[in-house]
């Protein structure tokens, strides 16, 4: 449905009726146009939800379910440039097409910004997204990520409610998490995972989950979680596959107890963790005798608060 | 040398709504190293925090006070505001704007304070 | 909320004493601890972010200690401008940031 352009009428004395038959007819349009994409975002989200157990599936059972993961994602692929299509004829913009478009950092990467720092997303009018500062990892192999969570100097708290969960604090160099709307936001394309951590003794270990989709809140930003790679012993993500995020305000978890008060920050509480990448931060000294804190299981147990901790996403078809 | 000035009427009626403006200069409410709060504190008495606001319009606000107020920012003026509403004579403080700093959540700049009384 | 709870309310004390003030939260607060200094009629001034911390241009005479619950504001040695009211800040269970009612000190 595209919008129609009329010509000027000939009788200057008709033109301000037809002017507002006009104005009636683009408003018309437009929130038809709007109304329209609001249905797509709201089956993209289910359909995309029900992609990415269809993944989990498929990787967990057998090869040949692999066609209907193809099937699905070209589905998925599809609705998108729907949505791109609709989006540019209802904003009535072509001057920036969405290969053009700046989502994310491996965005940025592809318009040869190279250099690891603070950068900003310009707002999203039409989806209502404000402009968002990331920080961008353009090194790590192969650069293009999209920092999501930092730990480094624990003076950022992160025993906070779903509403600023949900909006993102901290400070974008220092520690902080970017938002769960934001993060959701992100991850609505096929996605990569990547966690890095560091110990007190200088050890540096990562994990990388081959998709990562978090849900919209709705879905609690239910956190979804492909095959991991990496070195850090065993995957300590995977209990929390599937699981909703949970807040001191928010009890989402699969648990009798409160996790979120038990563990002491927000995060995808199962009963309650394997890891806990947004509990307390615990300095030298203090950092091997509580539960609450910074943990992997995998690596260095339940009570071993980690020194360094970052999260970090970029898209699955990323190519440096 | 960053300065915050609050802005705003100092007498408003009961069940009226109170409005302030906090005006920064000398740095910006864009940067996301800090965010921006609105603090009272009744004559004679502690200190209060109401909320605060993120250069993205990210708020957070006191659980007393949620359900009657707002707080907005106008990048473009370098301000952020406050709407108090319903408001009654325990409302009656001096309102500060102050600016936090994210890495220790700590409230580095402070306005000089405006007195709002509310009275019939 | 958590709340804080700061000993003594007022206190009398000499140029060149010692003073000390404290601060106790109704659960832990690990080091999300700040401290601040208001002189009548004025905005309060940050002195100590992360519960021992230092800001930066504050006397070196002002120091904090403490964890968990138990939080100490010591001025090693009063000059007569430090005659003030002092308040204790918790940063680490929000919304709310929560203040401790204050301790004046006060010229004996």
């Known amino acids: 449905q595209k919008l129609s352009k009329h010509k000027t009428p000939a009788q200057p004395q008709l033109k301000a009726a037809n002017c507002c038959e006009e104005v009636k007819e683009l408003k018309a349009q437009v929130a038809n146009l709007s109304s329209l994409l609001s249905e797509l975002n709201k089956k993209q989200e289910r359909d995309w939800v029900s992609v990415v157990m269809q993944v989990m599936e498929l990787e967990s059972n057998s090869k040949r379910m692999e066609s209907r993961l193809t099937d699905a994602e070209s589905k998925y692929s599809e609705m998108n440039n729907q949505i791109d299509i609709m989006q540019l004829q209802a904003a009535q913009t072509v001057t920036q097409t969405s290969a053009d478009a700046i989502y994310d950092c491996s965005s940025l990467y592809q318009k040869n910004y190279r250099i690891s720092g603070v950068y900003k997303l310009p707002p999203d009018d039409f989806l209502g997204s404000p402009e968002l500062e990331v920080f961008c990892d353009m090194e790590t192999s192969g650069g293009g990520w999209t920092i999501i969570q930092r730990r480094k100097s624990g003076l950022v708290s992160f025993y906070r409610d779903w509403k600023q969960y949900k909006q993102g604090f901290g400070s974008i160099r220092g520690d902080f998490w970017l938002g769960n709307e934001h993060i959701h936001r992100l991850s609505r394309q096929p996605t990569r995972l990547r966690v890095e951590m560091e110990d007190w003794e200088g050890n540096l270990r990562y994990a990388e989950y081959s998709h990562f989709v978090l849900g919209n809140e709705l879905n609690s930003y239910r956190l979804f979680l492909g095959n991991y790679t990496g070195n850090v012993g065993n995957d300590a993500l995977q209990y929390h596959n599937n699981t909703a995020f949970s807040t001191k305000d928010k009890d989402n978890d699969n648990c009798l107890d409160k996790c979120a008060q038990l563990r002491k920050g927000g995060y995808w509480y199962n009963c309650c963790t394997d890891s806990n990448l947004n509990g307390v931060y615990y300095r030298l000294g203090e950092h091997n005798k509580h539960l609450d804190g910074i943990t992997w299981y995998g690596w260095h147990g339940s009570t071993y608060s980690l020194k360094r901790v970052e999260m970090k996403i970029r898209p699955e078809d990323f190519k440096p | 040398q960053v300065q915050l000035q609050e802005s705003g009427p100092g007498l408003v009626k009961p069940s009226e709504t109170l409005s302030l403006t906090c005006t920064v200069s000398?740095?910006?409410?864009?940067?996301?190293?800090?965010?921006w709060s609105w603090i009272r504190q009744p004559p004679g008495k502690g200190l209060e925090w109401i909320g605060y606001?993120?250069?993205?319009?990210?708020?957070s606000y006191n659980p007393s006070l949620k359900s009657r107020v707002s707080i907005s920012v106008d990048t473009s003026k370098n301000q952020f505001s406050l709407k108090l509403s319903s408001v009654t004579a325990a409302d009656t403080a001096v309102f500060y704007c102050a600016r936090a700093k994210w890495e220790g959540d700590y409230f580095d700049y402070w306005g000089q304070g405006t007195l709002v009384t509310v009275s019939s | 909320d958590i709340q804080m709870t700061q000993s003594p309310s007022s206190l009398s004390a000499s140029v060149g004493d010692r003073v000390t003030i404290t601060c106790r939260a109704s659960?832990?607060?690990?080091?999300?601890l700040n401290w601040y200094q208001q002189k009548p009629g004025k905005a309060p001034n940050h002195l100590i972010y992360?519960?021992?911390s230092l800001q930066s241009g504050v006397p070196s005479r002002f120091s904090g200690s403490g964890s968990g619950t138990d939080f100490t504001l010591t001025i090693s040695s009063l000059h007569p401008e430090d005659f003030a009211t002092y308040y204790c800040q918790q940063s680490y269970s929000t919304p709310p940031y929560t203040f401790g009612q204050g301790t004046k000190v006060e010229i004996k």
């Open positions: 992360a519960a021992s």
């Open positions: 659960q832990s607060i690990y080091s999300y």
């Open positions: 000398g740095g910006s409410v864009s940067s996301g190293s800090y965010y």
């Open positions: 606001i993120y250069y993205s319009g990210s708020t």
